[in-house]
């Protein structure tokens, strides 16, 4: 069974899918549709890399500038570095500015929505 | 068959509001946004912004963000947009259009609901 | 917000004639659809992503463009594509129409 005959046998089931589930099947080639992945959990999307992603979703990640103003993807691209997100050249804007480090304070996330940042 | 039903026409008092409702049927709604898209007499189109039927997350053109108010009922795959404050110019044809998730054009359209307002 | 011009702004054209269509944006935009619209009814899609024929269009329509300039171009007209044309753009928020282009039959 290939990635893409794999992926419509579970779709139904991956609203609830953790990110150790979403980074595995990346590995597959299952080329996840927009409508699929705005249906995850945005806490299991979160920790995805950009490169996650992107094989994540193959052909349909030019979806993401469609979406870049909707949960979850919105709250993704918050998460990313700027440069990585330039990798995809689909003009997402949003990510975090080159040379700022980013500190995982899981209390100040909770409180704010968004990462805690370190300028340059 | 895919269809987005609008209600009738709509004849409101200035400073009143009115909630206009789109039922869909024929479709998976939470594959698609809802966006809605006005015209006036004559006039071009103009975006009034989109929602997400999976998160009720909603994107307004910055224009309409202290008019409108996009909202979706999924139980019964019904999206609405509820107009507040109204005055002359905001009489106009309004349609509900739906857009693919990851994708940015509207394949199917409502038959549009028209809108006089008038003292 | 990107600025959509539709030029003409009316035109005619006789049956079997080839018409072509413009839209230029203000700035870049990544692509651009096509939507007809006839009196009384709601806007139809036409093209997507620049050059896609949207289900159920007759071939006789097609898109293309990149950057700040699209066009549509009918390749024989006939009575039925009489009807106003916008284009529209999804690449920077908020979306935006064009003006239309109103085409008369001859």
């Known amino acids: 069974m290939n990635g893409s005959e794999y992926f419509v046998k579970i779709q139904s089931f991956l609203g609830g899918a953790p990110t150790e589930d979403l980074k595995a099947l990346s590995q597959q080639n299952v080329s996840m549709d927009l409508a699929t992945f705005m249906k995850l959990r945005t806490d299991a999307v979160l920790p995805l890399t950009v490169a996650e992603v992107q094989k994540l979703l193959g052909p349909h990640v030019e979806g993401l500038k469609a979406e870049e103003r909707h949960r979850p993807v919105r709250d993704w691209i918050l998460r990313q570095r700027q440069d990585d997100l330039d990798t995809l050249g689909l003009g997402l804007q949003g990510g975090i500015p080159n040379g700022y480090l980013v500190l995982d304070l899981s209390m100040q996330e909770a409180l704010s929505g968004t990462p805690c940042l370190l300028g340059p | 068959e895919v269809q987005l039903q609008q209600s009738g026409p709509e004849l409101v008092k200035p400073g009143a509001s009115v909630k206009i409702p789109c039922k869909t049927s024929?479709?998976?709604?939470?594959?698609?946004?809802m966006d809605w898209v006005k015209q006036s007499h004559g006039k071009s189109l103009e975006w009034i912004g989109d929602?997400?039927?999976?998160?009720?997350?909603?994107i307004y053109n910055q224009k309409f963000q202290n008019k409108a108010t996009l909202t979706v009922d999924k139980s019964s795959s019904t999206a609405y947009m509820e107009l507040r404050s109204l005055t002359s110019e905001d009489t106009a044809v309004y349609y509900c259009?739906?857009?693919?998730?990851?994708?940015?054009?509207?394949?199917?359209w409502g038959q549009g609901t028209t809108l006089t307002v008038s003292s | 917000q990107i600025v959509l011009t539709q030029s003409p702004a009316i035109m005619s054209a006789s049956p079997g004639e080839q018409v072509t269509m413009t839209c230029s944006a203000s700035s870049s935009v990544g692509y651009m659809n096509w939507y007809q619209q006839k009196p009384g009814s709601s806007p139809r899609l036409l093209i997507y992503d620049t050059s896609n024929l949207a289900s159920g269009v007759p071939v006789h329509f097609s898109g293309s463009g990149s950057g700040t300039s699209y066009s549509l171009t009918i390749s024989r007209m006939e009575a039925a594509f009489a009807a106003t044309y916008y284009c529209q753009q999804w690449y920077v928020y908020p979306y935006t129409f064009g003006g239309g282009t109103k085409l008369e039959i001859k």
């Open positions: 024929g479709y998976t709604f939470t594959d698609y946004n």
């Open positions: 929602i997400n039927p999976n998160t009720d997350g909603a």
């Open positions: 259009t739906r857009r693919k998730l990851g994708r940015k054009f509207f394949d199917y």
